[in-house]
Interface confidence: low
């Protein structure tokens, strides 16, 4: 299996890209998966080309996720959906921060008490029903090199 | 560069005890584990779990368990060598995973817009069997 390596996703200049990134989520073992058509969901398949995502560092803990693929920009909207868009707005931003247990979470930078999550299902997980604790919330930052 | 050397994983019987060690080279002013450290497991088919964790995030030198290993395992470390530790007792055939240690450590802060990077050993791998 891909190992993860050197997670600490945001720990460049902003403006400059790491290698691409799978994000496995604790919750189900699902790859966060942004589609070209704005959808985000999440799959088991790592070969999955839609799960090779580049985070950007904006300013110190704060990150945006594209994907490489899609080159669509991972969004949480005022009604708590997660989807991606074309162009980076205020709500593609998210504080990247280190849990007690060495996952990442990535919550919303405008909708603060909010996070990226991914259910059981492989669906994303509305922001509104997410929260700290929470196996949804939890992803480790994975190769996407091989 | 930062590498991490995992030993101390092999066959061990149900109910024994094994003790893994993560050994860290190519660090800076021996910073890499002062800012915590963890270990993972991955066995065959599954997903990777956390088992262990300590000194991570803002929990200063806190320690994380799983609830699969609370009671069985115990993770610790030796700035001085730059080593983390896991002592596995009470070992279950279900223990049975590759091992991987990962540690946290700051990147110069004049290159860190997020300051903690993460660094993943080659894993070692536990075999609980009779």
């Known amino acids: 299996p891909a190992l993860p390596e050197d997670g600490g996703s945001g720990a460049f200049p902003p403006g400059h890209f790491k290698d691409p990134k799978r994000l496995y989520c604790k919750n189900g073992g699902f790859f966060l998966r942004i589609h070209p058509d704005g959808r985000v969901d999440g799959v088991r398949e790592k070969s999955d080309p839609h799960i090779k995502l580049q985070l950007q560092a904006e300013e110190r803990g704060v990150v945006s996720i594209k994907g490489v693929c899609a080159n669509r920009y991972l969004a949480m909207k005022e009604d708590g959906r997660l989807l991606a868009s074309k162009c980076v707005t205020d709500e593609c931003f998210f504080f990247e921060r280190l849990e007690s247990n060495n996952y990442n979470t990535y919550r919303s930078r405008k909708y603060t008490s909010w996070y990226v999550a991914l259910k059981r299902t492989g669906q994303y997980k509305l922001g509104s029903k997410t929260g700290p604790g929470q196996k949804a919330i939890l992803f480790l930052p994975m190769s996407a090199k091989s | 560069q930062v590498q991490l050397v995992e030993s101390g994983g092999g066959l061990v019987q149900p109910g024994g005890s094994l003790r893994l060690s993560c050994a860290a080279s190519?660090?800076?002013?021996?910073?890499?584990?002062?800012?915590?450290g963890s270990w993972f497991r991955q066995a065959p088919g599954q997903g990777l779990e956390a088992v262990a964790a300590?000194?991570?995030?803002?929990?200063?030198?806190?320690?994380y368990y799983a609830d699969s290993v609370k009671g069985r395992f115990t993770i610790s470390r030796d700035n001085s060598k730059n080593t983390l530790y896991l002592q596995m007792n009470s070992l279950r055939a279900e223990d049975t995973a590759v091992y991987y240690c990962?540690?946290?450590?700051?990147?110069?802060?004049?290159?860190?817009?997020?300051?903690?990077?993460?660094?993943w050993g080659q894993g070692t791998l536990v075999t609980v069997s009779s």
């Open positions: 990962t540690a946290l450590y700051e990147r110069q802060p004049q290159l860190a817009a997020t300051k903690v990077a993460r660094k």
């Open positions: 190519g660090t800076e002013d021996g910073r890499l584990l002062t800012l915590g």
């Open positions: 300590i000194g991570a995030g803002d929990r200063g030198g806190a320690t």
